[in-house]
């Protein structure tokens, strides 16, 4: 039950995280004009990964896309790449984890397969979250660097006499959305990996115990190994003894006196 809950919660947390990563990637407010100790401009500038926008005091907002690919800073391209990789991995992870969910039955999929899928999706979520956090952090670092550079030179001289306003940018809402979303995806991935441990069939499976507690009839397999004991490699026969959902106690069961004739 706890495994199912952990897996389900991991899936939901990752889903929210990936939705957040997508939202952050699409948001225009990655960097916003710093209004503190700056010349008071009648317009408000903010920038995203894909376009820059200007909001005039009337509320009129105009956005212009970055229509060049080669002319963009390498760092911005790197951030775009990290965010896209994060989204793609997260989306694949979600798809995989849907089929891995214990509460969803798909044909005769074994628990081992579900465990593997849960682990795969968990790893994907972790990498996805890390990509998002890395992308946002790289952008934030770029902002901090540019901020102090423009603070050192608030106005850049042009021809000695003419001055041009140096717009300083600070952290936009998208950065915080990205950090939180990346963190959630990462946490969701870890939860999926933890759930995988509970789903994975152990080397010694004592689930058959409850079926043989009342009687002492022993079924022999070719080669002299007792099928009922669960010793040996019995994963192929596992479904025969699977009575349904296990509790935590069942996973931890130990041999009883009834296991031996």
């Amino acid at each position: 039950m706890a495994v199912t809950a952990c897996q389900g919660l991991g899936f939901v947390v990752s889903l929210i995280g990936i939705a957040g990563i997508i939202a952050a990637t699409c948001m225009d407010q990655w960097s916003t004009q710093d209004l503190y100790n700056n010349p008071v401009t009648a317009v408000f500038n903010y920038q995203g990964l894909w376009r820059s926008c200007v909001r005039e005091s009337s509320g009129f907002t105009e956005c212009r896309g970055y229509f060049t690919l080669l002319g963009l800073p390498a760092m911005l391209q790197a951030v775009r790449a990290l965010m896209i990789v994060g989204i793609v991995l997260g989306a694949i992870g979600l798809l995989v984890s849907i089929f891995a969910l214990k509460c969803i039955r798909i044909g005769s999929m074994e628990d081992s397969a579900k465990a593997n899928m849960t682990l795969t999706s968990g790893i994907m979520f972790i990498v996805s979250g890390l990509c998002a956090i890395a992308g946002v952090s790289v952008f934030a670092n770029m902002l901090v660097t540019n901020f102090w550079m423009s603070t050192a030179n608030m106005y850049t001289g042009m021809g000695g006499m003419v001055q041009t306003v140096q717009t300083r940018y600070t952290f936009g809402a998208a950065l915080f959305v990205g950090w939180v979303a990346g963190g959630l995806t990462l946490i969701g991935g870890v939860m999926m990996c933890i759930a995988c441990r509970g789903l994975a069939p152990e080397e010694t499976n004592y689930k058959a115990v409850s079926y043989h507690a009342s009687g002492h009839s022993v079924a022999y397999k070719p080669g002299g190994f007792k099928a009922s004991t669960g010793f040996g490699s019995n994963t192929k026969n596992k479904k025969i003894y699977d009575g349904g959902a296990r509790t935590e106690d069942e996973v931890q069961s130990y041999p009883s006196k009834h296991d031996y004739v």
Partner: antibody, heavy 119, light 113 residues
Framework: EVQLVESGGGLVQPGGSLRLSCAVS????????MHWVRQAPGKGLEWVAY????????YYADSVKGRFTVSRDNAKNSLYLQMNSLRAEDTAVYYC????????????WGQGTLVTVSS | DIVMTQSPDSLAVSLGERVTMNCKSS????????????LTWYQQKPGQPPKLLIY???TRESGVPDRFSGSGSGTDFTLTISSVQAEDVAVYYC?????????FGQGTKLEIK
Amino acid sequence: EVQLVESGGGLVQPGGSLRLSCAVSGFTFSSFGMHWVRQAPGKGLEWVAYISSGTTNIYYADSVKGRFTVSRDNAKNSLYLQMNSLRAEDTAVYYCVRSGYYGQSLDYWGQGTLVTVSS
Amino acid sequence: DIVMTQSPDSLAVSLGERVTMNCKSSQSLFNSGNQRNYLTWYQQKPGQPPKLLIYWASTRESGVPDRFSGSGSGTDFTLTISSVQAEDVAVYYCQNVYIYPLTFGQGTKLEIK
């Protein structure tokens, strides 16, 4: 039709106070920022103050800062300019102006009200 | 504060003639975010309040005759009247609408010869 009608102008002694009003009609007043611009007799235009639609942003010209206060009452479709510590150089025609939707332009102007500061 | 300087102070032209007047700002009025220049031109006829002609340095306000055109970027701007009409007699002002306090040029007076 957009209309801006200023009132409250007149003769006042130096150091005195005056409150100008601007009654607005023909557009959704609460959606637009508003400016006060003045023009001394025979002189050019001088921007005085700006108030945003929701009164979040208020800016003044250095020459009036600390003496003039701009305010608005969106429910009454009215703009105000409270002028204190008036000086002779404040003598001018005061225009109430709407801030345009595009390009920060000042698109609609009232006819103006004359303020004379003299002893 | 941004200082706006207009030239010439006045000019007299014949009807139908092409006229240009200049406006120079002490700081750039160009906003890189939307690639626009925040400069506005106004026309003030005698005894009337000013009228908006051009915003964003080159965009004509609706209802303004197409003989009026604006150009320039950064710090240097020009208002051109391609063929002067009698009703164009007025004082023309440029205004910085980019940085507060907003500032006007001293004006250029247009007269007919």
